[in-house]
């Protein structure tokens, strides 16, 4: 059974979350992808999305969010710059595939943003930074309004092998790791 796991990242205000979402490039390379926040009891809210079709390694910026889709590598890079405390929450990447429901990509990201300046960098496992020059050649993409009611966090269904199928359900596993992300001062 596929389990949609959650990783926790603790960052300070002003820093940058820099994550990657992994997808099957043969299936989804040019599909439109989105970054969503999931608030308890609510449907996921799309914050930013790539163009349709998604362009290879072409940065798309929506406010403080930058998306970059690497088709050859099956990776969507998501950066949230100049983090604020109110950015704390649960995030996920999805792939739009109308008329089917969006395909969710694991892992989900549990972001905790706290006030104050960061200390010394931690382990090399996870790299992020507190200042990032936003690329000059960014475009803003229009995102579909459609989000799946099946991804409401209050009622996560049972787990099956493929989270993209209409009947599939997701088992959110317990968060065991708190990953402290090193930052550049």
């Amino acid at each position: 059974a596929t389990k949609l796991t959650e990783e926790k990242y603790e960052l300070k205000e002003g820093q940058t979350l820099d994550v990657k979402c992994d997808y099957t490039l043969e299936k989804f390379a040019s599909s439109q992808k989105a970054w969503q926040i999931i608030r308890d009891g609510e449907m996921p809210k799309t914050l930013a999305c790539t163009e349709r079709p998604s362009k290879n390694s072409h940065p798309v910026q929506v406010g403080r969010i930058i998306l970059e889709d690497y088709h050859d590598h099956g990776l969507l890079r998501v950066r949230m710059v100049n983090l604020q405390v109110e950015d704390s929450g649960l995030y996920q990447c999805v792939i739009y595939q109308p008329p089917k429901e969006p395909h969710m990509l694991f892992d989900r990201i549990r972001l905790v943003v706290t006030k104050g300046f960061s200390g010394t960098p931690g382990s090399n496992e996870n790299s992020t930074q507190n200042v990032y020059k936003i690329p000059p050649t960014t475009t803003k993409a229009l995102c579909p309004l459609y989000t799946s009611p099946r991804t409401v966090t209050q009622a996560p269904p049972k787990s099956t092998a493929d989270v993209s199928t209409p009947d599939s359900e997701i088992n959110l596993t317990n968060v065991t790791d708190i990953i402290r992300v090193p930052v550049f001062n």
């Epitope: 992994d22 690497y70 050859d72 590598h73 090399n124 996870n126 790299s127 930074q129 990032y132 550049f184």
Partner: antibody, heavy 122, light 107 residues
Framework: QVQLVQSGAEVKKPGASVKVSCKAS????????INWVRQATGQGLEWMGR????????GYVQNFRGRVTMTRNTSISTAYMELSSLRSEDTAVYYC???????????????WGQGTLVTVSS | DIQMTQSPSSLSASVGDRVTITCQAS??????LNWYQQKPGKAPKLLIY???NLETGVPSRFSGSGSGTDFTFTISSLQPEDIATYNC?????????FGGGTKVEIK
């Protein structure tokens, strides 16, 4: 302790395929990307691509697309890199390397396999 | 692709000398730069990640600095065991790319 142990040296004829294995131990195999890097004799390091052991999804550098396949067997914590249609220029040492956590934009190779020499010769 | 230009390609210095290697990226890579040491017949070894962070267990005589396109790797006091080739690697954009390497020898 973290270890990546690769399969032994191979000699192949042009046009053949080679499959190199990389057995991981000392950490949770599915939590970190596995990358493949090659180095021809006297040359620099060349990244070939990466694989997420949790999902099995892989991505390859353009030069290798269509010839390389990266797979894994999570039950034995082993990653594989298969390169087909071999030519003499593919003669090199092939390394597997552990990358960052699967969800973070980090390609820091903190642990490497010992390398596998692949010789392509007629 | 981002080109990483390392200089010099080789150098010879005496034990105790300060050794400096530079790595220049063809475009801004922020601080997404790592340095590796490779001894003949061996796999590369991570020394410094994210421009300036010393990997656990690596002697403090190794250091790194820089940002954007220009980066520096320094050995404050060269030791006989430091004879090796040193490589920089960027990961700000895919594909990941390495510098051509700098071979360090003892005079």
């Amino acid at each position: 302790q973290v270890q990546l142990v690769q399969s032994g040296a191979e000699v192949k004829k042009p046009g053949a395929s080679v499959k190199v294995s990389c057995k991981a131990s000392g950490y949770t195999f599915t939590s970190y990307d596995i990358n493949w890097v090659r180095q021809a004799t006297g040359q620099g390091l060349e990244w070939m691509g990466r694989m997420n052991p949790k999902s099995g999804n892989a991505g390859y550098v353009q030069n290798f697309r269509g010839r390389v396949t990266m797979t894994r067997n999570t039950s034995i914590s082993t990653a594989y890199m298969e390169l087909s249609s071999l030519r003499s220029e593919d003669t090199a040492v092939y390394y597997c390397a552990r990358g960052g956590r699967t969800s973070i934009w980090s390609f820091v190779f903190d642990y490497w396999g010992q390398g596998t020499l692949v010789t392509v010769s007629s | 692709d981002i080109q990483m230009t390392q200089s010099p390609s080789s150098l010879s210095a005496s034990v105790g000398d300060r050794v400096t290697i530079t790595c220049q990226a063809s475009q801004d890579i922020s601080k997404h730069l790592n340095w590796y040491q490779q001894k003949p017949g061996k796999a590369p070894k991570l020394l410094i990640y994210d421009t300036s962070n010393l990997e656990t267990g690596v002697p403090s005589r190794f250091s790194g600095s820089g940002s954007g396109t220009d980066f520096t790797f320094t050995i404050s006091s060269l030791q006989p065991e430091d004879i090796a080739t040193y490589n920089c690697q960027q990961y700000d954009k895919l594909p990941l790319t390495f510098g051509g390497g700098t071979k360090v020898e003892i005079k």
